[in-house]
């Protein structure tokens, strides 16, 4: 009931945009800037001075960044007692990009809304917003979480249910951006297992694999461009790298999607009525990985059953030699442990500076692909010559 | 495979991709609450962080959260 | 503080009609979607109808489409419910609700409509 | 429309007894859901939201849980304010509707 007492502004400084514009350029990322949308004139339009500020500074520097307005702004009302409603957030949209193409930012790139998940009057809010403003983003940003940390329980994670809700929720994005504005690239702007931090002794846990392998294979399949995880590193228990800078199971498993998982999204299915607890993925391979080459397939599935599996490759790949990149939980707290094995080897860091090999398993052609119970696995399905991927 | 073994056969459809998602399809965030951590120069200076940071490259670094909305820049703070 | 006070109920015959209002206070009333909510003597409860922040959008349950009416006025922080051809199964106990996506946090105390005749 | 199941129907425990009561959605609804407590004469008050977040000012003795289509509302002690009927309502679409109500009586 009105808890928009619960936050209050703080400021940041030049040295801080230093540190974080200077920490994504040294590690090969490109740098998104969430500016603060609850500045407002007495007449609820957005205003741009603080922004302004900000871009001149970013400007003198010669960043390169992209930007967002605003986050989760259906929520305004329960975090602030404001409401905006999408027409006017479209209006201050518009605002941003002039500025931005008043500056030495004339091609930066402009992201948004970030709603949370298309509830009914949050798919409302994106609608009016993407016919407001819909024009002047590059992308379409949207959050989504599984879960609420505070309650959420192992069987959760390991619940084919849940990880099913998310469809429904990419669908109605999608019903909302083809009726505003069709075409219009869709990404997660924000998203992780449970909300509220994550959940205490499972969001950085083995188990909370599945939620994420099923969410980009989900993501990939449905038509969403870019996924970005909730958090790379910070407080909470969803992070990827925790605050001893050690990597967690969920940073090994984006480790290996990155180096192992291409751009072109084709399409894996279980042949039956089971398939909820086995979920299969298929791409063309990351060509940028040395050990392929154009024309294979990378396949990525996850078993939810509690025996093992043996998935049976179809015509004309059956007889192709395959290399098996399984993930299984190390040590006595099993799907809750914070190690992870590949191929039975345990992932660390070798020292600050290098990140171990990940070392496939040829298997030998011919042979099923064997996934033990609660586990997932990347099979990369070599010489596969696969004509959309080349 | 033996004939007591749990076998699923898959079906692929590879004629022509589904989708072509970003080749930075898989990013990650910094929750801009960091930003207001003590720390927050130190931690993001940190050799290790970068190096696994750089693992992931290409790909986005989104700084939000619900701290973006109360976050005001000070070019004077020091 | 938020009050939400409904007003307007009482005994009416079968085919005959009502308006409720509900006064509200505390809160921004323009930010907030509004809902009515009614409960029949005894039984559960049963949404009727919500409407947008700015009136444009209204939504009501099947039984009383055509008959009922949701409308507001912001400037006088005022939720209405006009109800025509009023029958005997709607007579309740009803409610006026502050509505979130998530939960309706605030309800009067409600207002009864007997029909009768 | 979504029509909402509560179990069981009514209920009597005893203070410091803990009570589970769920409510089953003909369909997925995410986690749309919201508990309310209704004491006689009274209007309904909002305890859980979003099937799992407790109101601000609501006893933490109370939770919920759940997601898609089976929810559960958990008085962990029940104390003696807490008899009372308890209903689960849904807002992922609508028509919104609520289950028909669980009545917590004293044994």
């Known amino acids: 009931a009105d808890p928009g007492k619960k936050f209050k502004n703080s400021t940041y400084s030049r040295s801080s945009v230093d540190v974080l514009y200077t920490f994504a350029n040294c590690s090969g990322l490109d740098l998104i800037f969430g500016l603060n949308a609850l500045l407002r004139t007495a007449d609820l339009q957005w205003n741009s001075s603080n922004a302004q500020l900000l871009l001149d500074y970013c400007s003198s520097k010669g960043y390169n960044i992209s930007w967002e307005l605003g986050n989760e702004p259906n929520s305004f009302l329960k975090k602030a007692d404001i409401f905006i409603n999408g027409s006017q957030l479209g209006e201050d949209f518009i605002q941003l990009h002039k500025l931005l193409r008043k500056s030495t930012f004339k091609n930066a790139k402009l992201y948004g809304p970030d709603v949370g998940q298309p509830r009914r009057k949050t798919a409302k809010m994106l609608k009016s917003f993407l016919k407001a403003g819909g024009e002047v983003i590059d992308s379409v940003t949207w959050h989504h979480y599984y879960l609420n940390g505070r309650t959420a329980t192992k069987e959760d994670f390991l619940n084919p249910d849940v990880l099913d809700i998310f469809i429904s929720s990419v669908q109605k994005v999608f019903q909302v951006v083809e009726s505003t504005r069709p075409g219009k690239k869709v990404w997660l702007g924000e998203t992780s297992s449970a909300y509220g931090g994550g959940a205490p002794l499972l969001s950085d846990t083995f188990a909370a694999g599945f939620m994420w392998l099923d969410k980009l294979g989900l993501s990939a399949r449905m038509g969403i461009e870019v996924v970005m995880r909730q958090v790379f590193f910070g407080a909470g228990n969803y992070h990827l790298v925790d605050e001893n800078f050690d990597p967690l199971p969920d940073y090994w498993l984006s480790l290996l999607f990155k180096k192992l998982v291409g751009t072109k999204v084709l399409m894996a299915s279980v042949q039956g009525s089971k398939r909820r607890k086995l979920r299969v993925y298929l791409h063309c391979t990351n060509t940028d990985n040395p050990r392929y080459k154009e024309g294979d397939l990378t396949l990525y599935a996850i078993n939810l059953h509690n025996v093992t599996k043996y998935l049976r490759l179809p015509y004309p790949f059956s007889n192709k030699q395959v290399d098996k990149y399984l993930l299984r939980p190390l040590g006595p707290h099993g799907l809750l442990s914070k190690s992870v094995q590949l191929n039975g080897l345990t992932l660390k860091m070798v020292d600050d500076q290098t990140l171990p090999p990940l070392m496939e398993k040829p298997l030998r052609p011919g042979s099923s692909l064997g996934l033990p119970a609660f586990s997932y696995s990347f099979f990369v399905i070599r010489n596969a010559k696969v004509a959309a991927c080349i | 495979a033996d004939p007591g073994q749990d076998v699923v056969d898959l079906d692929f459809f590879t004629q022509e991709p589904l989708h072509l998602v970003s080749p930075s399809f898989l990013s990650v965030t910094i929750d801009a609450n960091l930003a207001t951590d003590p720390r927050f120069l130190i931690l993001l200076g940190s050799p290790k962080l970068r190096t696994l940071a750089r693992g992931l490259s290409p790909a986005y670094l989104r700084f939000g959260g619900t701290k973006t909305d109360f976050l005001i820049f000070d070019p004077k703070k020091e | 503080e938020v009050q939400l006070v409904e007003s307007g109920g009482g005994l009416v015959q079968p085919g005959g009609s009502l308006r409720l209002s509900c006064a509200a206070s505390?809160?921004?009333?323009?930010?907030?979607?509004m809902s009515w909510v009614r409960q029949a003597p005894g039984k559960g409860l049963e949404w009727v109808a919500s409407?947008?922040?700015?009136?444009?959008?209204?939504y009501y349950v099947d039984s009383v489409k055509g008959r009922f009416t949701i409308s507001r006025d912001n400037a006088k922080n005022s939720l209405y419910l006009q109800m025509n051809s009023l029958r005997a199964e709607d007579t309740a106990v009803y409610y006026c609700?502050?509505?979130?996506?998530?939960?309706?946090?605030?309800w009067g105390q409600g207002t009864l409509v007997t029909v009768s005749s | 429309a979504i029509q909402l199941t509560q179990s069981p129907s009514s209920l009597s425990a005893s203070v410091g007894d803990r009570v589970t009561i769920t409510c089953r959605a003909s369909?997925?609804?995410?986690?749309?859901l919201a508990w309310y407590q209704q004491k006689p004469g009274k209007a309904p008050k909002l305890l859980i939201y979003?099937?799992?977040s407790l109101e601000s000012g609501v006893p933490s003795r109370f939770s919920g849980s759940g997601s898609g289509t089976d929810f559960t509302l958990t008085i962990s002690s029940l104390q003696p304010e807490d008899f009372a009927t308890y209903y689960c309502?849904?807002?992922?679409?609508?028509?919104?509707?609520f289950g028909q109500g669980t009545r917590l009586e004293i044994k």
């Open positions: 609700a502050r509505e979130l996506d998530w939960g309706w946090d605030y």
């Open positions: 505390g809160f921004t009333f323009s930010s907030y979607w």
């Open positions: 409407i947008y922040q700015d009136g444009s959008e209204k």
């Open positions: 369909q997925g609804i995410s986690s749309a």
């Open positions: 979003d099937a799992s």
């Open positions: 309502q849904q807002f992922n679409s609508y028509p919104i509707t």
